[in-house]
């Protein structure tokens, strides 16, 4: 589904949300670092309802959540976080 959002710059996200998403609605979070033709970092939230949301990396809630997840990184994460580049 996400492949539809490829642009000539190979970015996946054309629209980003800053709205808080509770963890119980989240399946996993994908972090796409800058590079591979996309000039910005992208965060993609895969929700349990099978929909996908691109989150503004500057959104306060996602920064706060990532900080919490970083602190817990030594234990099992309640929300899987995948950091990988697009091949």
């Amino acid at each position: 589904v996400l492949e539809v959002y490829y642009t000539s710059l190979r970015c996946r996200c054309v629209q980003e949300s800053s709205v808080f998403i509770p963890r119980r609605f989240i399946d996993r979070i994908q972090i796409l670092p800058r590079g591979n033709g996309c000039p910005r970092k992208e965060i993609i939230v895969w929700k349990k309802n099978k929909s996908i949301v691109c989150v503004d990396p500057q959104a306060e809630w996602i920064q706060r959540m990532m900080e919490v997840l970083r602190k817990r990184s030594s234990s099992t994460l309640p929300v899987p976080v995948f950091k990988r580049k697009i091949p």
């Epitope: 800053s18 709205v19 808080f20 509770p22 809630w61 706060r64």
Partner: antibody, heavy 120, light 107 residues
């Protein structure tokens, strides 16, 4: 237009049971989480329970989980709350609400409520 | 459970006044807070979600702010139709919890 209509309230004796219903229209009911929220006379709002579209995830207020059961029938666009061993403190207006997990991630549509009175 | 302490529990203000309600949360809820308006005999109506986002159709005089444990709801210029009880609610995690409410009256 989204409509949530609760029914099934009434007068019941302590220790009795009641089953509330919420009929939904104007929404794709089978896509949404749903909740029950109650409000005792002159008091604030108290969340009761929620259920996901597939009925595979259900969460309750800890103080109510042993006596109340939330369920749904997507084919009938209906939400239910089975209340057992009712007590005087369960007297309240019971609201059903749609829990949006697409945009707001909270309860964006509410019914008008049905009144439950527990008294001897 | 996450406790929501809302203040004041009641307040009286004049038309045109700026009104502020606060909600203190017992633990960090990120920006997972909503604000509702409830008029007597009616169901609550969603006004603000994600701490600061106005719900569809909500007038711009209503606003919200905050994150973590401290949240604020503001009516920039009170109108007669704003007379109601206002509730904060956290939806960061279950059990979902509400503040005790703030009953707003016109002077």
């Amino acid at each position: 237009e989204v409509q949530l209509v609760e029914s099934g309230g009434g007068l019941v004796q302590p220790g009795g049971s009641l089953r509330l219903s919420c009929a939904a229209s104007g929404i794709d009911f089978s896509r949404y989480w749903m909740s029950w929220v109650r409000q005792a006379p002159g008091k604030g709002l108290e969340w009761v329970a929620e259920i996901n579209p597939e009925s595979s995830t259900i969460n309750y207020a800890p103080s109510l989980k042993d006596r109340f059961t939330i369920s749904r029938d997507n084919a009938k666009n209906s939400l239910y709350l089975q209340m057992n061993s009712l007590r005087a403190e369960d007297t309240a207006v019971y609201y059903c609400a749609r829990q949006d997990d697409y945009e707001t991630y909270t309860m964006d549509y509410w019914g008008q409520g049905t009144t439950v009175t527990v008294s001897s | 459970d996450i406790q929501m302490t809302q203040s004041p529990s009641s307040l009286s203000a004049s038309v045109g006044d700026r009104v502020t309600i606060t909600c203190k949360v017992s633990q960090d809820v990120n920006t997972g807070v909503a604000w509702y308006q409830q008029k007597p005999g009616k169901a609550p109506k969603l006004l603000i979600y994600s701490a600061s986002y106005r719900y569809t159709g909500v007038p711009s005089r209503f606003s919200g702010s905050g994150s973590g444990t401290d949240f604020t709801f503001t009516i920039s210029s009170l109108q007669p139709e704003d007379i109601a009880t206002y509730y904060c609610q956290q939806y960061y995690s279950t059990p979902l919890t509400f503040g005790g409410g703030t009953k707003l009256e016109i002077k």
